[in-house]
Interface confidence: low
C-alpha cells in the first residue's frame, strides 16, 4: 500500500490522543533505554509503511501484535485517514484470524514496540534531520 | 492542526516568581488520557524532565532539583497547563517546552522521552 494520500496530521492526532499511550501501556515495566532504536523511517510515507510492517506483520519471536489495543487503533486510523487501505488489508485479516494464538508478551515483542514508539516519533516529527 | 504555545518566560532575579502556561490548540486536554508536563533545555545542556501532571487522576511528579519550588496545574475549562516557579535559581535558567506525548511515573519524568511541540519560552534567572 502506498501510504502517499494518507492525512498525517489526522493520523498525528490519533496518535496523540490514544495510540502512544497504549504503546506506553504496553511497554510498562520496562525502561525506555533498554532497546537501541534500529528502525527508522526518512519521511511520512515511509514511517507509516514501517510501523505497518512491524505492527501486523509476525516476526520471528512475536507473533502477532495485531491484537493488541495500540495495534487495532492504528488499523482504524490508517482505514479511516488513508484513502482505499482497508480494502488492502481484508485478505490480510481473514488470514491472521486462522492463525490467531494466544497472547504472549515476549522480550522480542517488547523491542519491536519500542522500535514502534521510535517509528511513531519519527513520523510526528517530519521536518527533524536524520541523525 | 496540534499545536502547544507556552508563554510566562522572562527574566527574574533569584528568589523569584514566574508562572509559565501551556495552551493547546488543535486538541482538548478534558478529551484524551494524556499525561502533561514539561521539560527544559539550558544553553549547551541536555533536555531535562521537570514535571508533569496526570490527565487521568491529577497526579504530579516532580525532578528533585525543583521538588518544593514549582507547582504543576491544568485547567482543562481553559485548555492550559501551568507551572508555578517560586524561589527561583540561577540554574533554573532555560528554555521551558511543554509537551503531551509523554508519560510520567514514579520512575521519574527525566526518564522519557520529549517531543517539543512549541517554541517555549525563555526564563532567565539572575544572581
Known amino acids: 500500500y502506498d501510504f502517499t494520500n494518507c492525512d498525517f496530521e489526522k493520523i498525528k492526532a490519533a496518535y496523540l490522543s490514544t495510540i502512544s499511550k497504549d504503546l506506553i501501556t504496553y511497554m510498562s515495566g520496562t525502561k525506555s533505554t533498554e532497546f537501541n532504536n534500529t528502525v527508522s523511517c526518512s519521511n511520512r510515507p515511509h514511517c507509516l509503511t514501517e510501523i505497518q510492517s512491524l505492527t501486523f506483520n509476525p516476526t520471528a519471536g512475536c507473533a502477532s501484535l495485531a491484537k493488541e489495543m495500540f495495534a487495532m487503533k492504528t488499523k482504524a486510523a490508517l482505514a479511516i485517514w488513508c484513502p482505499g487501505y482497508s480494502e488492502t488489508q481484508i485478505n490480510a485479516t481473514q488470514a491472521m484470524k486462522k492463525r490467531r494464538k494466544r497472547k504472549v508478551t515476549t522480550n522480542k515483542c517488547l523491542e519491536q514496540v519500542s522500535q514502534l514508539q521510535g517509528l511513531w516519533r519519527r513520523f510526528n516529527r517530519p521536518l527533524l534531520k536524520q541523525q | 492542526e496540534v499545536q502547544l504555545v507556552e508563554s510566562g518566560g522572562g527574566l527574574v532575579q533569584a528568589g523569584g516568581s514566574l508562572r509559565l502556561s501551556c495552551a493547546a490548540s488543535g486538541f482538548t486536554f478534558a478529551d484524551y488520557d494524556y499525561d502533561i508536563g514539561w521539560f527544559r533545555q539550558a544553553p549547551g545542556k541536555e533536555r531535562e524532565g521537570v514535571s508533569c501532571i496526570s490527565n487521568r487522576d491529577g497526579s504530579t511528579y516532580y525532578t528533585d532539583s525543583v521538588k518544593g519550588r514549582f507547582t504543576i496545574s491544568s485547567d482543562n475549562a481553559k485548555n492550559t497547563v501551568s507551572l508555578q516557579m517560586n524561589s527561583l535559581k540561577p540554574e533554573d535558567t532555560a528554555v521551558y517546552y511543554c509537551?503531551?506525548?509523554?508519560?510520567?511515573?514514579?520512575?521519574?519524568?527525566?526518564?522519557?522521552?520529549?517531543?517539543?511541540w512549541g517554541q517555549g519560552t525563555l526564563v532567565t534567572v539572575s544572581s
Open positions: 509537551a503531551v506525548e509523554i508519560h510520567c511515573d514514579d520512575y521519574g519524568v527525566e526518564n522519557f522521552d520529549f517531543d517539543p
